[in-house]
């Protein structure tokens, strides 16, 4: 979603979105200086009026959080940045059309890996987003993407892996050797929009089998 650079004052105006947190970012060009200031405006696709983003007027940092302003994941949005440097004319650049549903990337899930003697349990915790339901609840990724599922891998050694996947939040890899270290990885996928998170990785050791020690 990057605009073409035609000025030395401002370039690469784009949205960077992760788990529906939508941050507008940009770079200062070679002509920008430490006194260059930036102002941000945004609008919903189809509307004429640009709205100034409070807190992102005449700022020196090169980012602006537009999560709340672009919260409706079913809508498209534009944002634009105006750069002003001492004595020079303002330069404005606009983003491409932005849809958080299409463009957001998915962060690794939050997972608890629980070792047992002959198994490892993995509990996936639902990921909250800033997107709100009509009654004001924060939505989880699972409530936004019908096709969201989890892919779990357990690396037993360099040559052998065990796999599980599904829409459940609780999984258990069974039939493992006691007192052995395993590497688990859990990824979120949404097939229709071709999204895939980086994996959450946990290194866990099954518990020692103490039953024989007391016989």
């Amino acid at each position: 979603h990057t605009t073409v650079d035609t000025s030395g004052l401002l370039q690469h105006v784009k949205f960077q979105s992760s788990n529906f947190e939508n941050i507008l970012t940009w770079d200062g060009g070679p002509a920008s200086t430490s006194d260059t200031v930036y102002s941000v405006e945004y609008k919903k696709y189809g509307e004429r009026k640009w709205l100034a983003k409070a807190g992102c007027q005449r700022i020196t940092q090169k980012f602006c959080n537009l999560t709340m302003e672009t919260r409706n994941h079913t809508e498209f949005y534009y944002a634009k940045v105006t750069a002003v440097s001492a004595g020079g004319p303002p330069v404005t650049k606009m983003t491409d059309r932005f849809s958080s549903l299409q463009h957001t990337t998915i962060k690794p899930p939050d997972v608890t890996c629980i070792p047992k003697v002959r198994s490892i349990q993995m509990l996936v915790h639902p990921t909250l987003t800033p997107v709100l339901s009509e009654d004001g609840h924060q939505l989880t990724l699972e409530e936004i993407f019908h096709d969201l599922f989890y892919r779990l891998e357990l690396h037993v050694n360099h040559t052998y892996q065990m796999h599980l996947e599904g829409k459940q939040r609780e999984y258990e890899f069974l039939g493992l050797t006691p007192d052995t270290e395993f590497l688990g990885s859990i990824t979120i996928l949404t097939p229709i929009l071709s999204k895939e998170s980086a994996p959450y990785v946990c290194r866990v050791k099954t518990l020692p089998d103490r039953t024989w020690a007391y016989s």
């Epitope: 997107v131 339901s133 409530e143 936004i144 096709d147 599980l164 996947e165 459940q168 229709i192």
Partner: antibody, heavy 117, light 107 residues
Framework: EVQLVESGGGLVQPGGSLRLSCAAS????????MYWVRQAPGKGLEFVSV????????HYVESVKGRFTISTDNAKNTLFLQMNSLKSEDTAVYYC??????????WGQGTQVTVSS | DIQMTQSPSSMSASLGDSVTISCQAS??????LFWYQQNAGQPPKLLIY???RLQTGVPSRFSGSGSGTTFTLTISGVETGDLATYYC?????????FGQGTKVELK
């Protein structure tokens, strides 16, 4: 105990409308994926529509898009399917179902919809 | 849409026989597959999820296998209560789609 009870089926003429209801209990209705699935006489099963009761996100099978509308009343734990411009090929038993802990494991007993002149 | 092709469409079995039903997906669905049993006039009952995991309360004579595009449901030792229609369902992407069903009857 999870319970889903459909109602609202009946005989309707082609081009007519019906509104199906599904009363739900025994689980957290206000944060679930709810489905309408149909089965034509002597035929297989077909998913018609789905809604997330919290986000309001909906999906439809292509054959009913623009004619059917899925909705909920979370205060009353009820799922609806508004069916307009009905065709003879919509004749079926309509089931509501829900996904709990990742699995589509709970179904109602179904309500019969017959579209005929 | 993902097409699910189930075979055979019907089969006859004697009590105690082993029965195998196949399901083919038109694209890779990993292990996102359910198997259901349906008796006449009743809603479907979940038997297998994740292609091979047995749902709680389902007898161990039912088993599922496969991944990617090819899946199998096996009933090891058919009992009277198993005479029904069986459906596979892909849970990978919307619209969720069923196979055409396999009716298991008594020989």
């Amino acid at each position: 105990e999870v319970q889903l009870v459909e109602s609202g089926g009946g005989l309707v003429q082609p081009g007519g409308s019906l509104r199906l209801s599904c009363a739900a209990s025994g689980f957290t209705f206000s944060s679930s994926w709810m489905y309408w699935v149909r089965q034509a006489p002597g035929k297989g099963l077909e998913f018609v529509s789905v809604i997330n009761t919290r986000s309001g996100i909906t999906h439809y099978v292509e054959s009913v898009k623009g004619r059917f509308t899925i909705s909920t009343d979370n205060a009353k734990n009820t799922l609806f399917l508004q069916m307009n411009s009905l065709k003879s090929e919509d004749t079926a038993v309509y089931y509501c179902a829900t996904r709990i802990q990742g699995l589509i494991d709970y179904w109602g007993q179904g309500t019969q919809v017959t579209v005929s002149s | 849409d993902i097409q699910m092709t189930q075979s055979p469409s019907s089969m006859s079995a004697s009590l105690g026989d082993s029965v195998t039903i196949s399901c083919q997906a038109s694209e890779n669905i990993g292990t996102q597959l359910f198997w259901y049993q349906q008796n006449a006039g009743q809603p479907p009952k979940l038997l297998i999820y994740g292609a091979s995991r047995l749902q709680t309360g389902v007898p161990s004579r039912f088993s599922g296998s496969g991944s990617g595009t090819t899946f199998t449901l096996t009933i090891s030792g058919v009992e009277t209560g198993d005479l029904a229609t069986y459906y596979c369902l892909q849970d990978y992407s919307w619209p969720l789609t069923f196979g055409q069903g396999t009716k298991v009857e008594l020989k």
